[in-house]
């Protein structure tokens, strides 16, 4: 998904939460220097995904992928790319 | 930078009502099975997380959005 390129750490954390993988979540949260209370909070969200099973995780992953690849987001990504190109051109 | 639609989705997941969150999801995926699942997850998070937990989760999101990796 193109949007993952714009904020990879967000998608790392989201998919670690939705996956139910505690180790992966810890690794992702370390990258943003999350405190212990912050980790506890994120694990509570992860618990909900785990408790509701695989189908629940797949469906919510589908929602995030759909939003991320929607015109609302892709339009945003295109706009950002255009602005980056302008800046690069001016920089030269 | 994170897409505003994604940011709104996550914010409502943590701070919105179940209706507000599911209505937002419905704008992108209006399938009953998806929307019921979204409500179940939202209800679970609301039941498990204290206000302090939610503030901590929002704090993680702030760190994510301001990270060089975003």
């Amino acid at each position: 998904v193109k949007m993952a390129e714009t904020c990879p750490i967000f998608y790392d954390v989201f998919f670690a939460v939705a996956n139910g993988n505690e180790l992966l979540l810890d690794l992702s949260l370390t990258k943003v220097n999350a405190t212990e209370p912050e980790r506890t909070a994120m694990k509570k969200i992860q618990d909900c995904y785990v408790e509701n099973g695989l189908i629940s995780r797949v469906l919510d992953g589908l929602v995030m992928t759909t939003i991320s690849s929607s015109k609302d987001c892709m339009g945003e990504a295109v706009q950002n790319t255009v602005e980056d190109l302008k800046l690069n051109t001016l920089g030269r | 930078e994170i897409c505003p639609a994604v940011k709104r989705d996550v914010d409502l997941f943590l701070t919105g009502t179940p209706d507000e969150y599911v209505e937002q999801v419905a704008q992108y995926k209006a399938l009953p099975v998806v929307l019921e699942n979204a409500r179940i997850l939202k209800n679970c998070v609301d039941a498990k997380m204290t206000e302090e937990d939610k503030e901590n989760a929002l704090s993680v999101l702030d760190k994510i959005y301001t990270s060089p990796l975003c």
């Epitope: - | 599911v22 209505e23 419905a26 399938l31 009953p32 929307l35 019921e36 699942n37 179940i40």
Partner: antibody, heavy 123, light 107 residues
Amino acid sequence: QVVLVESGGGVVQPGRSLRLSCAASGFTFSSYGMHWVRQAPGKGLEWVAVIWYDGSNKYYVDSVKGRFTISRDNSNNTIYLQMNSLRAEDTAVYYCARSLIPVAGTDPIFGYWGQGTLVTVSS
Amino acid sequence: DIQMTQSPSTLSASVGDRVTITCRASQSVSSWLAWYQQKPGKAPKLLIFKASGLESGVPFRFSGSGSGTEFTLTISSLQPDDFATYYCQQYNTYSPTFGQGTKVEIK
């Protein structure tokens, strides 16, 4: 918060008509399917009718088909149940209920209910 | 129409008891099943949907399970506020149907 208020119930003779209303507030009315569910005195629950969020589809329980009509006015946040050719067996408390899930979620899960209005069909 | 059958019709229990109500469908309804609680003179209240999903504000002592044709509602530790009538309801079709109800009364 979600509030549903039914009105229009009363005592009516068999064969006559009655129109029930349900005024809704506290949510995005035009996003949700709306239902009528009834309960005869001392009995269980029976779903009566549904109207989709945009009014495009309507479904009824077999026993009221051709006699009852569900409708909605999204500008006034109100749904109606027009009941014609009433029978003694239609005597019940009629509840207005909102679908739990919006838009495509006209799945008949009754997330919110009104307090009900009593319809008595008797000569 | 799909017929829903609840058992028992009446259940006598004490505060603190674990209570289980069963609901059977005449044909498979997958996981499209909801449970409601109703107190005398009041409208029903949604407890559980999609067989096991707890509705907002419903205490964790309520839980639902099952799929296909057999479902259960469990109250892990009955509280004074839980004495009421409980209904299951299938929504696999656009003609939803309810069970006949199970009254949970004080022993």
